[in-house]
């Protein structure tokens, strides 16, 4: 969490941002909130990016003002116009690119004063893994697949029964470049699996950590997946 305060002149206002991560090719949100004003026409929101000449986005007098918008953001940004009045200056970003990573500034002017806060935005690719029993294999084998990751993640297997065991000798992980030549498909195979056990396939890079669990018993197979973004710090 980054909390910024105003500059000289008028009173300062508190602006709060949250560091976040964008999944390339998907839509993202850069979070920013501020002390609200009672009049929408008095609020100015400017989003800036370090190293970019033009603005990322500007909202003033109750509407977007995109005359100074940098070409790289054309047609890709929007604020939640109906939520500006309650202090939400968050930015919706379409079709996140690797090059969108960097330091952004959320700069606010209201009748109460001015304020700004920086936000670190990471970009990469992350997806939920799915673990299945590989019935084509000669021995009991599990196959963990996740369609989109970048940068290349690490893959670690774990089991409930053999806690702390190292499965690197009995697993094989491969990374296959996807058609857009940036993200990769992750496939990891675990051999010599025993029944009545829960196995976890953990995929992690510097942006996200995802886990796919599978419980194999005589009578059923239960699966569960979850994904967590790393370093979501507020400022």
């Amino acid at each position: 969490l980054i909390i910024g305060f105003g500059i000289s002149g008028r009173h300062s206002i508190t602006v709060t941002t949250v560091a976040s991560a964008g999944n390339i090719g998907e839509d993202g949100i850069l979070s920013c909130t501020f002390e609200p004003d009672i009049k929408l026409s008095d609020i100015v929101i400017q989003w800036l990016k370090e190293g970019v000449l033009g603005l990322v986005h500007e909202f003033k007098e109750g509407k977007d003002e995109l005359s100074e918008q940098d070409e790289m953001f054309r047609g890709r940004t929007a604020v939640f116009a109906d939520q500006v009045i309650v202090g939400n200056a968050s930015l919706r970003l379409k079709n996140v690119q690797l090059t969108d990573a960097g330091t952004y500034k959320c700069y606010i002017i209201t009748s109460k004063g001015k304020g700004n806060a920086n936000l670190e935005y990471k970009t990469g690719a992350f997806s939920m893994p799915e673990v299945n029993v590989d019935y084509n294999a000669s021995s009991e084998t599990l196959r963990c697949e996740a369609p989109r990751w970048f940068p290349q993640p690490t893959v670690v297997w774990a089991s409930q029964v053999d806690q702390g065991a190292n499965f690197s000798e009995v697993s094989n992980t491969s990374f296959e470049l996807n058609s857009e030549n940036v993200t990769m498909k992750v496939v990891s195979v675990l051999y010599n699996v025993t029944i009545n056990n829960t196995y976890s396939c953990m995929i992690e890079n510097d942006i996200a950590k995802a886990t796919g669990d599978i419980k194999v018993t005589e009578s059923e197979i239960k699966r569960r997946s979850h994904l967590q973004l790393l370093n979501s710090k507020a400022s």
């Epitope: 090719g25 998907e26 839509d27 509407k63 977007d64 003002e65 995109l66 005359s67 918008q69 070409e71 054309r74 047609g75 890709r76 940004t77 929007a78 116009a81 919706r92 379409k94 079709n95 058609s179 857009e180």
Partner: antibody
Framework: QLQLQESGPGLVKPSETLSLTCTVS??????????WGWIRQPPGKGLEWIGN???????YYNPSLKSRVTMSVDTSKNQFSLKLSSVTAADTAVYYC????????????WGQGTLVTVSS | EIVMTQSPATLSVSPGERATLSCRAS??????LAWYQQKPGQAPRLLIY???ARVTGIPARFSGSGSGTEFTLTISSLQSEDFAVYYC?????????FGGGTKVEIK
């Protein structure tokens, strides 16, 4: 409510320049949250996005037409224009102007369209 | 450029029946997709944006769904005024592209 109206010659000779103007009424072309776009539709076929312009004059064109397209805006007249050079019979189409959301980038409303035929 | 493919090209439906129109993108467009209705001699009319958000004034019988590469426009109970051509449009990346259209005709 906002209305758009295309105007311009309905017949253009091959190799010449097609020129159309879109007049916006019931609202200002300076609406900051919108671009102003051109879309065309050859007879009996689908829709093709030509490009857009912001009231400040910044433009973005479809790469397939970029070398031949020029768009301009006249805020004093609440109008924006399209020029397409070196036309051929393949450019025969109904040409629509439309308001384009800055994001989400929908088109609404549209002009009623004007048929431009390229023929000698 | 992202290629949008609509199916079927023609859909024959009786009034009061349900119509399901499909739109497929050549690569993921997230939910950056709009649907339009076009009647003969008229300009297209926006129905749905962001894949599922219905435009103000559009009847509730029109609904959109999907994300990524597969999208659907559903007309729950076709009225006589709904017989038209429907287009999908992606605005995920430039250049914006439209599908070839689905003609919904009276059976």
């Amino acid at each position: 409510q906002l209305q758009l109206q295309e105007s311009g010659p309905g017949l253009v000779k091959p190799s010449e320049t097609l020129s159309l103007t879109c007049t916006v009424s019931g609202g200002s072309i300076k609406s900051g949250s919108h671009y102003w776009g051109w879309i065309r539709q050859p007879p009996g076929k689908g829709l093709e996005w030509i490009g857009n312009i912001y009231y400040s004059g910044s433009t973005y064109y479809n790469p397939s037409l970029k070398s031949r397209v020029t768009m301009s805006v006249d805020t004093s007249k609440n109008q924006f224009s399209l020029k397409l050079s070196s036309v051929t019979a393949a450019d025969t189409a109904v040409y629509y102007c439309a308001r384009e959301g800055s994001y989400p980038n929908w088109f609404d409303p549209w002009g009623q369209g004007t048929l431009v035929t390229v023929s000698s | 450029e992202i290629v949008m493919t609509q199916s079927p090209a023609t859909l024959s439906v009786s009034p009061g029946e349900r119509a399901t129109l499909s739109c497929r993108a050549s690569q993921s467009v997230s939910t950056n997709l709009a649907w339009y209705q076009q009647k003969p001699g008229q300009a297209p009319r926006l129905l749905i944006y962001d894949a599922s958000a219905r435009v103000t004034g559009i009847p509730a019988r029109f609904s959109g769904s999907g994300s990524g590469t597969e999208f659907t426009l559903t007309i729950s109970s076709l009225q006589s005024e709904d017989f038209a051509v429907y287009y999908c449009q992606q605005y995920h990346s430039f250049p914006f592209t439209f599908g070839g259209g689905t003609k919904v005709e009276i059976k």
